[in-house]
Each structure stands twice: as structure tokens, then as C-alpha cells.
């Protein structure tokens, strides 16, 4: 019985060349979070492990920074960074919770942040 929910930053947009923070928050469960994975489509961006700390995938280490918290900061954004991002919470004893964020990188200097929403 998985009772938790993941709240994310939802659909967000940012300027090309800028940076953005991807954030997820797991609530409504007392489960122990053992690890959080950040993925873009099928690519692993980073892992934050409760014991071992952060690991950034080598191919992203120049543009991805850990934090704040269990979030992830994407830097030097390009239009190719547009797409879906997933935070995957590995927990005991519940198992895995996944949150989704859609990022749109705009050429324009007018980039507005979307509203927060919840994914059960």
C-alpha cells in the first residue's frame, strides 16, 4: 500500500543559456527514502544516495549541479534540453515513487514558471 505523493515544480520554462532548478518532494508517507534518481527520458542525470551522497553522470557533470536539497540544477540550458525530466524516489518499504517535470527552453527572454502540481 503506497500512500505517498510526489509534488513537483510541474511544467516550467526557462531561457536558453540560463539555469533552472528541478524540484520534487515526497509527502504523505513515513517511508525511508534511500535514493533519488534524476532522469531525462531514458538518460540518468544524477543520483543522490542517502549514504553515499551525490553522483553526477559524467556526460552531464559540466552542466548539472546537485541541489538544492534533493533537487537538481541545470545550467547553460539549450533548446535540446526541452523535454521530460523524472525524479525517482527509491523508498523502503513502499518501493518507487516517480514525479514528472516538463521543461521548455525558450529562445525568448520571456520565460515564465508554471504552477506546482501533484502526481500521486
Amino acid at each position: 500500500m503506497m500512500t505517498g505523493t510526489i509534488e513537483t515544480t510541474g511544467n516550467i520554462s526557462a531561457e536558453k543559456g540560463g539555469s533552472i532548478i528541478l524540484q520534487c518532494h515526497l509527502s504523505s508517507t513515513t517511508a525511508q527514502v534511500t535514493q533519488v534518481n534524476w532522469e531525462q527520458q531514458d538518460q540518468l542525470l544524477a543520483i543522490c544516495n542517502a549514504d553515499l551522497g551525490w553522483h553526477i553522470s559524467p556526460s552531464f557533470k559540466d552542466r548539472v549541479a546537485p541541489g538544492p536539497g534533493l533537487g537538481l540544477t541545470l545550467q547553460s540550458l539549450t533548446v535540446n534540453d526541452t523535454g521530460e525530466y523524472f525524479c525517482i524516489y527509491h523508498t523502503y518499504p513502499d518501493g518507487t515513487y516517480t514525479g514528472r517535470i516538463f521543461l521548455e527552453v525558450l529562445e525568448s527572454s520571456v520565460a515564465e514558471h508554471g504552477a506546482r502540481f501533484q502526481i500521486p
Epitope: M1, T3, T30, Q32, V33, T34, C48, G69, P93
Partner: antibody, heavy 120, light 108 residues
Amino acid sequence: EVQLVESGGGLVQPGGSLRLSCAASGSTFSNYWMNWVRQAPGKGLEWVAEIRLKFNNYATHYVESVIGRFTISRDDSKNSVYLQMNSLKTEDTAVYYCTMVRRNWYFDVWGRGTLVTVSS
Amino acid sequence: EIVLTQSPATLSLSPGERATLSCSASSSVSSSYLYWYQQKPGLAPRLWIYSTSNLASGIPDRFSGSGSGTDYTLTISRLEPEDFAVYYCHQWSSYPYTFGQGTKLEIK
């Protein structure tokens, strides 16, 4: 073998304060959730407070009867957890146990307890 | 708050007999979050069973646990003298974590 040793208990008047300490040895303290559980004389067990890991931003939770009066904290560099108890009431009289928990390792160790007596 | 009610409050049995201790929750508890502890006089509680049915390290296999939802049971197939103690069920499924009031298993 992991050992937990509580200290700081004693006799205090209603409205007074005490600070309980729990020192851990024999393990990587920072990897464990820490809890305080109390047991009034001749009564059952009551969970009091929990503090999680740096990984969880040191999230804390309390039983309703102590919210606003008790504060749990930890110092991973000293392998210690604390319970600051203010505005003590006679019903806070109990043996206070420190517990060290790692759910996914099925690890659950208790100290021997320290007696807090609130009486005029 | 999830209230755990244990029954009976006291169970008087003789060594060699079978003991059945019950724990009833006021609302559903996931079986992974239901633990049992044993406590002897003057000592701290000790984890006895975790996740409803798994014996903690060093616990003899005459002990077993079962249950789901709101009803859980600790069973001792054949009582040994060292089994006489107080047993508490415990849930960490939701805050505040709670314990049952305990079942005292005493020698008849």
C-alpha cells in the same frame, strides 16, 4: 556492537527544563534515524520524537502532546542526539529511551533509558 | 492517530503451551510498517518481529507473526520460560507513531 547511552535525566519542577543527550558508538551514526520513546512508571511505550538524516534535511516529527515544548536535534560530528524539554509537566515523568533505526537494514537499537521526574 | 489495541491485557499460560497475542488497529496499517517488541522488567524494549512476520536477529523460530489491514497476531508455538515478558505492537505507517498498550505474558 552499537551502543546508545542516554544522560541528562533527573528531578525537575513543573514548568522547568531539561536537555537529554544520547551518545552512540560502534556505527556510522549519520546513517540512522534517531527517535525518543518514553515510558511512564508502570505504563506502556509512547513515541515522542524523530529526527531523520541530513539527506532528509534533518526532518523532525513529534507526538502532539509535546509540540512546542520539546525539540529534537542531532550532531552527527558528535554521534549524538538531543531532546530539549521545556515547560515540563508532571505527565512528562517517564523513562526516556533513545532509539537508533535503519528500516531497510532491519536495524533497531535502544539505549537503557534515563529517568525524568517532574514533581514539585 | 492510529490507535493499537492489544488483547488480552494479561495472558496466563504454562511453559509448553501455545500463546496467541492480538493487535487491532483503528485504521489500516500496511503490513510492512507493523512491528512487535518484547520488554522484560527493568530493561529496554527489544525489536522482536518486523514487517508483521519477519523475526529480528536472534529470535527463535517458535515465534511467528501474521496479519494484515487492521488485525495482527504474534504467536508462540511452545512457550519457554524466557518468553514470559510484555509484548508491544507498534506502527510507523503514519505520524504519530504509536504502540499498543502491551500484553503481559505471565506464568500460570
